[in-house]
Amino acid sequence: APVRSLNCTLRDSQQKSLVMSGPYELKALHLQGQDMEQQVVFSMSFVQGEESNDKIPVALGLKEKNLYLSCVLKDDKPTLQLESVDPKNYPKKKMEKRFVFNKIEINNKLEFESAQFPNWYISTSQAENMPVFLGGTKGGQDITDFTMQFVSS
């Protein structure tokens, strides 16, 4: 079944942008001016998820790349990774659970909770130039709030 998708950029609540760091990792850092063109453009898709009153299930792909953010166990710890997929089959309404994030929107701030690992969130560090990761704490040092901006093609 077709899915509703949009193209956007994400910035954390400290206004750090997300950029590629090697082929399979994202990092967060402050960008200005022309450097803003480095930021990753996501293709966010509305997918099937568990019933909830305040969470909207989405998948986060990298625009025009066959890469999706996914959540897997590595060394017994929930971990965020970029995973290659067959572009002929993605995005789809029924995404595998590791690709699904529950988007929680409060006062124009977005959180992305892993559907596979409840209470684990896409996170950035306070420090500059550090990897985007899956964090198990909210409201601590690490940043779990993001803002979204549409990208005009």
Epitope: R4, L6, N7, F46, S52, I56, V58, K93, F150, S152
Partner: antibody
Framework: EVQLVESGGGLVQPGGSLRLSCTVS????????MSWVRQAPGKGLEWIGI???????YYASWAKGRFTISKDTSKNTLYLQMNSLRAEDTAVYFC?????????????WGQGTTVTVSS | EIVMTQSPSTLSASVGDRVIITCQAS??????LSWYQQKPGKAPKLLIY???TLASGVPSRFSGSGSGAEFTLTISSLQPDDFATYYC??????????FGQGTKLTVL
């Protein structure tokens, strides 16, 4: 305060075209999706389509081809281009804001602009 | 496309009555359903989203329930301001968003 104001309605002949505008304030089109919904006289609500970024628009099956939604974020303005208009397109046209991205529901509405298709 | 069917199409009731409006989807939409109230010459107003969550500023006499393909809107004790037309809306089935045909609530 969230405000949406439609304009551009009026009388148009069958086969003609019309472009409606919806100017918004109190929020940004760069982070909210917008729909167009219409209501024929004495009839129910009919969803036309929705726009996220300028490349991501979705339409009701009946609206594909004749209706095009676009926006100018710098002007905080949403548009509905209507072509090959027919008598059955006579309606009040509303713009509406999606409450949250992909929520589908609409928490802010304009007052509507009336389109009459008649010779 | 998913079709939304409301019943009844018209409903007459009195102030203080308990009123129930139903909405059926042609296939399961989980809890992706909203309800709106519209008064003549006015824009619709969001009442309930995700089947049961009250929108901001909506009185608690309104409630929604249901999941899958069957949904209800209940007004526990009808007030004079509640006479209006009510619409359900599928918000999550595929790429299309569809309204029911409406239920007109009139004074008995």
């Amino acid at each position: 305060e969230v405000q949406l104001v439609e304009s551009g309605g009026g009388l148009v002949q069958p086969g003609g075209s019309l472009r409606l505008s919806c100017t918004v304030s109190g929020f940004s089109l760069s982070s909210y999706a917008m729909s167009w919904v219409r209501q024929a006289p004495g009839k129910g609500l009919e969803w036309i389509g929705i726009i996220y970024d300028s490349a991501s628009t979705y339409y009701a099956s009946w609206a594909k081809g004749r209706f095009t939604i676009s926006k100018d974020t710098s002007k905080n303005t949403l548009y509905l281009q209507m072509n090959s208009l027919r008598a059955e397109d006579t309606a009040v046209y509303f713009c509406a804001r999606e409450r949250q991205i992909f929520s589908g529901d609409m928490d802010g509405w304009g007052q509507g602009t009336t389109v009459t298709v008649s010779s | 496309e998913i079709v939304m069917t409301q019943s009844p199409s018209t409903l007459s009731a009195s102030v203080g009555d308990r009123v129930i409006i139903t909405c059926q989807a042609s296939q399961s939409i989980d809890n992706w359903l909203s309800w709106y109230q519209q008064k003549p010459g006015k824009a619709p107003k969001l009442l309930i989203y995700r089947a049961s969550t009250l929108a901001s500023g909506v009185p608690s006499r309104f409630s929604g329930s249901g999941s899958g393909a069957e949904f209800t809107l209940t007004i526990s004790s009808l007030q004079p301001d509640d006479f209006a037309t009510y619409y359900c809306q599928n918000t999550g089935g595929g790429v299309s968003i569809a309204f029911g045909q409406g239920t007109k609530l009139t004074v008995l």
